[in-house]
Interface confidence: medium
């Protein structure tokens, strides 16, 4: 079976506070079996912003259905930007156990906010 | 304006070595991953290399996997190939590239510096 | 590995007349596709981007399409310094990053 690949395109993405930010990220393989979550930031500190098996995370949503079998595309919309938003977005594969543990991650993007045009 | 001159290639025996360097100059150097891209004679591009602007990000493609090692010094704002074990299929012009800052296309090339490997 | 194919190989034409290149990708790539212009001794020029959209003083005879895994470099009206080689990149699926084999552009 291939290798699983986390493919998150952009390396940086900028939006206008108040608007919605989408975070780009496709993975190659369905296995291992287990959820994508996404984290802003790295190491101890990273927040999390989605996971497919929690919720509800009110101002994400997924670009695709996440809840199809076949589906491999773990894309996200954030709406309402703010600067607190700024940061460095991980598209992170688990594998399936009691708990879930990180199996990959993808590059990253980094999210930029404008000011709000006047 | 952007500038990228490539220098370090000519002429060797497979199984020797050489190092390319690619000097930038008209942009934030450390701010900007960038690649080493190649062209064998009547050949299309084959990328070969990337460094992230920190240096920490490293890949290579398959063919040069073990043998090139790609760094670079953000004091001096030069990029470098050190490549080893050479062969007759890296025959080619060595280009350096800069990435744009948001995706992986190439906003700016140099115009290359010719290795031959030959016995 | 995502690899792509442009056709045709070679592009004979005359000034004046409109060329059409065309790469496919092995999957999809979105519209994460670049197309590179490159004559001898020179650098490699960055064209397209996006697909679609031109680069930074590039002129509007050249116009790029397609998505997925589909995509089309036009030029609509060749001008003698447009003849050259054009390759197109795909930076989606990375690294590798790729290039197609090149289509060249020559004059009838």
């Known amino acids: 079976e291939e290798e699983l690949q986390i493919i998150q395109p952009d390396k940086s993405v900028s939006v206008a506070a108040g608007e919605s930010a989408i975070l780009h990220c496709t993975i190659t393989s369905l296995f291992p079996v287990g959820p994508i979550q996404w984290f802003r930031g790295a190491g101890p500190a990273r927040v999390l912003i989605y996971n497919q098996r929690q919720g509800p995370f009110p101002r994400v949503t997924t670009v695709s259905e996440t809840t199809k079998r076949e589906n491999m595309d773990f894309s996200i919309s954030i709406s309402n930007i703010t600067p607190a938003d700024a940061g460095t977005y991980y598209c992170i594969k688990f594998r399936k156990g009691s708990p879930d543990t990180e199996f990959k991650s993808g590059a990253g993007t980094e999210l930029s906010v404008r000011a709000k045009p006047s | 304006d952007v500038q990228l001159v490539e220098s370090g290639g000519g002429v060797v025996r497979p199984g020797e070595s050489l190092r390319l360097s690619c000097a930038a100059s008209?942009?934030?150097?450390?701010?900007?991953?960038m690649n080493w891209v190649r062209q064998a004679p009547g050949e299309g591009l084959e990328w070969v290399s990337l460094i992230s602007g920190s240096g920490e990000i490293i890949y290579y493609a398959d063919s040069v996997k073990g043998r090139f090692t790609i760094s670079r010094d953000n004091s001096k704002n030069t990029l470098y190939l050190q490549m080893n074990s050479l062969r007759a299929e890296d025959t080619a012009v060595y280009y350096c590239?800069?990435?744009?800052?948001?995706?992986?296309?190439?906003?700016?090339w140099g115009l290359g510096t010719l290795v031959t490997v030959s016995s | 590995e995502t690899v792509l194919t442009q056709s045709p190989g070679t592009l004979t034409l005359s000034p004046g007349e409109r060329a059409t290149l065309t790469c496919r990708a092995s999957q999809s790539v979105y519209t994460y596709l670049a197309w590179y212009q490159e004559k001898p001794g020179q650098a490699p020029r960055l064209l397209i981007y996006?697909?679609?959209s031109r680069a930074t003083g590039i002129p509007d005879r050249f116009s790029g399409s397609g998505s997925g895994t589909e995509f089309t470099l036009t030029i609509s009206s060749l001008q003698s310094e447009d003849f050259a080689v054009y390759y197109c990149?795909?930076?989606?699926?990375?690294?590798?990053?790729?290039f197609g084999g090149g289509t060249k552009v020559e004059i009838k």
């Open positions: 008209g942009f934030t150097f450390s701010s900007y991953d």
């Open positions: 990149q795909q930076y989606y699926d990375r690294p590798p990053l790729t």
């Open positions: 590239a800069k990435e744009n800052n948001r995706y992986r296309f190439f906003d700016d």
């Open positions: 996006g697909a679609s």
